[in-house]
């Protein structure tokens, strides 16, 4: 059960309620574990993880990425700018996580867990950011057409897209985790 979704610590019946910071930290680590499992299936199924042709597929994608201006790195750190970027980035990743839903055979449940846990994480972070400026959400129509476009790709491009989404999402979450530990 993902942390934050009524998980019960069986070994510790007297567990205190998780603090906001702990919930966020645990949620990100839970999602990262899920991504690792999905990457394992992707890499076992195809040679995408060793491919040098990633640039071809990346042209079709506009995956969220941390940049210096986002204030999430040690150099130029800005906690408010960074938190907005993390939430905005996660919201932008949602369409790509939806795309992943039909891309796995043995890890179908894991793909769903990553998607649902990300939604929960966004809620946690929005609570943390309640005093910050409004966060812009992606346009549903744009997302729908992007999803259609991605699903219409040939098999090789779909495999590469899956690999790139997982890799980018992992990198984004790792950067987010490091930054959030300071907040």
């Amino acid at each position: 059960v993902p942390p934050g979704e009524d998980s019960k610590d069986v070994a510790a019946p007297h567990r205190q309620p998780l603090t906001s910071s702990e919930r966020i930290d645990k949620q990100i680590r839970y999602i990262l574990d899920g991504i690792s499992a999905l990457r394992k299936e992707t890499c076992n199924k195809s040679n995408m993880c060793e491919s040098s042709k990633e640039a071809l597929a990346e042209n079709n994608l506009n995956l969220p990425k941390m940049a210096e201006k986002d204030g999430c790195f040690q150099s130029g750190f800005n906690e408010e700018t960074c938190l907005v970027k993390i939430i905005t980035g996660l919201l932008e990743f949602e369409v790509y996580l939806e795309y992943l839903q039909n891309r796995f055979e043995s890890s179908e449940e894991q793909a769903r867990a990553v998607q649902m846990s990300t939604k929960v994480l966004i809620q946690f972070l929005q609570k943390k950011a309640k005093n910050l400026d409004a966060i812009t959400t992606p346009d549903p129509t744009t997302n729908a057409s992007l999803l259609t476009k991605l699903q219409a790709q040939n098999q090789w491009l779909q495999d590469m897209t899956t690999h790139l989404i997982l890799r980018s999402f992992k990198e984004f979450l790792q950067s987010s985790l490091r930054a959030l530990r300071q907040m």
């Epitope: 007297h14 205190q16 910071s21 530990r181």
Partner: antibody, heavy 119, light 106 residues
Framework: EVQLVESGGGLVQPGGSLRLSCAAS????????MSWVRQAPGKGLEWVAK????????YYSDTVTGRFTFSLDTSKSTAYLQMNSLRAEDTAVYYC????????????WGQGTLVTVSS | DIQLTQSPSSLSASVGDRVTITCSAS?????MYWYQQKPGKAPKLLIY???NLASGVPSRFSGSGSGTDFTLTISSLQPEDFATYYC?????????FGQGTKVEIK
């Protein structure tokens, strides 16, 4: 050299106030969260409070919530602990500590400043 | 709050000895740290996130464990290692510390 220097400790009567300072040098102050940890004479360590790098988020132990306030002046690379309604049990050496970037570890510590609450 | 219990509270050892200090948490913790403190000095970070060696710390120090049980090991005790050692955990706020283990010269 990376350094944290605490000051502002001293003798204060119960119910009184004191403001501790923690001056940072040798590193860029802005990306790091800071904490205060105290140690009563001959006793163990007790975490008191944390502040995020820009001061947007603060966390306090139950023992000091409502009495202590953690703040920053980033232009001076200095952290402050405003201590009000002081009690005898607040008597301790107060250390400020810098959090390791990307982790929760308290990595760099100052030499400490002694606060004595007594009538 | 999460309680940390260190054992032993104190120990006597000789230079070259292998020393093991344990830290038991009242419930499962997310991250564990170990500190060394000498009289009149500030604590010094030795180990972070259970087993990572802090910058500048000799490799004779190592940390292990997960869940509720953690260990600090000094593989070969050196004269400068006689001090008090504290475990500290983070699983959300507050951070909490163990009561300390004093390592003395036999």
């Amino acid at each position: 050299e990376v350094q944290l220097v605490e000051s502002g400790g001293g003798l204060v009567q119960p119910g009184g106030s004191l403001r501790l300072s923690c001056a940072a040098s040798g590193f860029t102050f802005s990306p790091f969260a800071m904490s205060w940890v105290r140690q009563a004479p001959g006793k163990g360590l007790e975490w008191v409070a944390k502040i995020s790098p820009g001061g947007s988020w603060t966390y306090y132990s139950d023992t000091v919530t409502g009495r202590f306030t953690f703040s920053l002046d980033t232009s001076k690379s200095t952290a402050y602990l405003q201590m009000n309604s002081l009690r005898a049990e607040d008597t301790a050496v107060y250390y400020c500590a810098r959090q390791l970037w990307g982790y929760y570890a308290l990595e760099i510590w100052g030499q400490g400043t002694l606060v004595t609450v007594s009538s | 709050d999460i309680q940390l219990t260190q054992s032993p509270s104190s120990l006597s050892a000789s230079v070259g000895d292998r020393v093991t200090i344990t830290c038991s948490a009242s419930i499962s913790v997310s991250y564990m740290y170990w500190y060394q403190q000498k009289p009149g000095k500030a604590p010094k970070l030795l180990i972070y996130d259970m087993s990572n060696l802090a910058s500048g710390v000799p490799s004779r120090f190592s940390g292990s464990g997960s869940g509720t049980d953690f260990t600090l090991t000094i593989s070969s005790l050196q004269p400068e290692d006689f001090a008090t050692y504290y475990c500290m955990q983070w699983s959300g706020y507050p951070y909490t510390f163990g009561q300390g283990t004093k390592v003395e010269i036999k």
